[in-house]
Interface confidence: low
């Protein structure tokens, strides 16, 4: 299966409804500690305000944030853990009317209630230590 | 800790092409994603490529297509191939090491010292 740039970057329209689909596999053990990020973007600029920020510490911690007038909010952290050392996933943020809701290989992990207006969101950009087969909007 | 020195600069018409190289010392190199940043008088500091360990790649959308990074994990080298020089590629050029891939220049610890690359037209 042919590989997806990374950082990956794609303008997007989201609204409740919409599901964005991630296929990538860490591209290190988790010795050494490989990152996930995957940004919602209010603007096709990576310097942009962030409504939803979700960066994986794999083998370790999940963050989620925002970041508007360029500071960075309060972060929501979570211990859970799904990913696998070396394994390929499957990850789908779900947009719901109140929340985003992020599925890993099929089961909800993660939820973040919106505090930018989803409508806002310009581009995702997905970026790191991954290697990425799958990027995929669904509204 | 990782050193990284760059080469290969220097004037050339527009339209022309030139090769720039980037030696790091250390044993650990393969252990880090390689960039190419590069930087204009008065501007800030742009991202032009990068590439991960395993020679994954992206580059800026003002070099697609003209520029491109390579690595060569048996001796320590990063090459930038740059075709079609415009006189806005004109900047200095910097290497950068850093563990995780990125284009934001605030992910990468190592940096050297650039190497001035001018075109003119």
């Known amino acids: 299966m042919s590989l997806l740039s990374v950082p990956h970057t794609e303008s997007v329209s989201l609204s409740t409804g919409s599901t964005v689909t991630i296929e990538a596999r860490p591209l290190v053990c988790f010795f050494n500690e490989p990152h996930l990020q995957v940004d919602f973007h209010t603007e096709m600029k990576e310097d942009s305000d962030i409504a939803f920020h979700f960066q994986v510490y794999f083998g370790n911690r999940v963050v989620m944030n925002s970041r508007e007038y360029r500071t960075w909010k309060e972060e929501v952290e979570s211990k859970n853990m799904p990913f696998q050392d070396g394994q390929e996933f499957e990850l789908r943020i779900l947009v719901l009317e109140d929340k985003y809701q992020v599925m890993v290989n099929g089961q909800a992990y993660y939820n973040f209630n919106h505090r930018i207006p989803v409508s806002s969101v310009k581009m995702v950009q997905v970026w790191r230590d991954i290697s990425l087969t799958k990027f995929n909007v669904s509204n | 800790e990782l050193q990284v020195v760059e080469s290969g600069g220097g004037l050339v018409q527009a339209g022309g092409s030139l090769r720039l190289s980037c030696a790091a010392s250390?044993?650990?190199?393969?252990?880090?994603?390689m960039a190419w940043f590069r930087q204009a008088p008065g501007k800030e500091r742009e991202f032009v490529a990068a590439i991960t360990r395993s020679g994954g790649n992206t580059y800026a959308d003002s070099v697609k297509g003209r520029f491109t990074i390579s690595r060569d994990n048996a001796k320590n080298t990063v090459t930038l191939q740059m075709n079609s020089l415009k006189p806005e590629d004109t900047a200095a050029y910097h290497c950068?090491?850093?563990?995780?891939?990125?284009?934001?220049?605030?992910?990468?610890?190592?940096w050297g010292q650039g190497t001035q690359v001018t075109v003119s037209s």
């Open positions: 250390g044993r650990t190199f393969s252990t880090y994603s």
């Open positions: 950068a090491a850093g563990g995780t891939y990125s284009f934001v220049p605030r992910s990468y610890n190592y």
